[in-house]
């Protein structure tokens, strides 16, 4: 015998209290697949979260973070404070990258400058707190007496950063 609930489409639930007829999901709930016996409560984007996509009867709300924060985790389960380029977030707040490391984003950690010699290359542009080095030709490719290292590009505006 076919389960009568299997006829209930997304956006409805199979209501045992009404002899297994398909009832629409109540306000602030959804069912994304057919044949559901309950509707799920919509996610609410509160506090540091803001609504990226409203909840509908067939799909959950989606949240992102308010300015100054960025998403972490699957489906933006957490919001983490932004830092400036050239910094990383520690338990004590945003801290400048140590010498030899950089962060060109508002999120994430300070990473070591690329070791150009790993690839048999020379350093073409020096690294900064905000930028990785740019690797250039192998030292053998440089003409005698030619200087290989360019000073880093001028520092950018603090807001000028990825994501």
């Amino acid at each position: 015998l076919q389960d009568p609930c299997s006829n209930c489409p997304a956006g409805t639930f199979c209501d045992n209290n009404r002899n297994q007829i398909c009832s629409p999901c109540p306000p602030n709930s959804f069912s994304s697949a057919g044949g559901q016996r309950t509707c799920d409560i919509c996610r609410q984007c509160k506090g540091v979260f803001r609504t990226r996509k409203e909840c509908s009867s067939t799909s959950n709300a989606e949240c992102d973070c308010t300015p100054g924060f960025h998403c972490l985790g699957a489906g933006c389960s957490m919001c983490e404070q932004d830092c400036k380029q050239g910094q990383e977030l520690t338990k004590k707040g945003c801290k400048d990258c140590c010498f030899g490391t950089f962060n060109d984003q508002k999120r994430g950690i300070c990473r070591p400058w690329t070791n150009c010699s790993l690839d048999g290359k020379s350093v073409l542009v020096n690294g900064t707190k905000e930028r990785d080095v740019v690797c250039g030709p192998s030292p053998a490719d440089l003409s005698p007496g030619a200087s290989s290292v360019t000073p880093p590009a001028p520092a950018r505006e603090p807001g000028h950063s990825p994501q």
């Epitope: 994430g108 400058w113 690329t114 790993l118 690839d119 542009v125 740019v134 690797c135 001028p154 994501q163």
Partner: antibody
């Protein structure tokens, strides 16, 4: 020599998912970003996102955030990109690339993987 | 996102001609501008990185110049093997973006 070898062409139905692989050889896999780039038929190149295999840190183009998931397996020196809820507009050649000693240009490209979405 | 306006979208030139392609980002990208060649078989190769640096092994007829929001790619003397589509790309700010490409044909 440094090489990126991608998995073969795929034909998928709308709504399905596909996982494209990119096997790296000839260098230390964990020391360089792997990027993924899309090229739809007759179109230009679009950056999808990248991964730093050492710690699996990822960046995504907002446009592809709900479409692509990029992962890496250090033990096999392989990067992956999974595309979900496929639609006809996902039909494209997908390239993996490695950066040129820092993350601002790409000097190694895979041969490309054609993904066709058709009912 | 930074928009990359590349022109022309296609051009036809004779062997030995000087060919110039321009790329204009929608905001200052310092020198983080790269040029790629895509052959008809779809293989892609980096030619020039950091605006003007020729990748090792790339013929010296290819060159690049510019800074900020105005960049130029030049082939000083076109060869038959240069038939390809050329793309600029900015590596300054995520998401990294490409120009729409210039398809180069031989007359």
């Amino acid at each position: 020599q440094v090489q990126l070898v991608q998995s073969g062409a795929e034909v998928k139905k709308p709504g399905a998912s596909v996982k494209v692989s990119c096997k790296a050889s000839g260098y230390t896999f964990t020391s360089y970003w792997i990027n993924w780039v899309k090229q739809a038929p007759g179109q230009g190149l679009e950056w999808i996102g990248n991964i730093y295999p050492s710690d699996s840190y990822t960046n995504y183009n907002q446009k592809f955030k709900d479409k692509a998931t990029i992962t890496a397996d250090k033990s096999t020196s392989t990067a992956y990109m999974e595309l979900s809820s496929l639609r006809s507009e996902d039909t494209a050649v997908y390239y993996c690339t490695r950066d040129y000693g820092s993350s601002y240009s790409y000097n190694v490209w895979g041969q490309g993987t054609t993904v066709t979405v058709s009912s | 996102d930074i928009q990359m306006t590349q022109s022309p979208s296609s051009l036809s030139a004779s062997v030995g001609d000087r060919v110039t392609i321009t790329c204009r980002p929608s905001q200052d990208i310092s020198n983080y501008l790269n040029w790629y060649q895509q052959k008809p078989d779809k293989t892609v190769k980096l030619l020039i990185y950091y605006t003007s640096r020729l990748r090792s092994g790339v013929p010296s007829r290819f060159s690049g110049s510019g800074s900020g929001t105005d960049f130029t790619f030049t082939i000083s003397s076109l060869q038959p093997e240069d038939i390809a589509t050329y793309f600029c790309q900015q590596g300054d700010t995520l998401p990294y973006t490409f120009g729409q490409g210039t398809k180069l044909e031989i007359k």
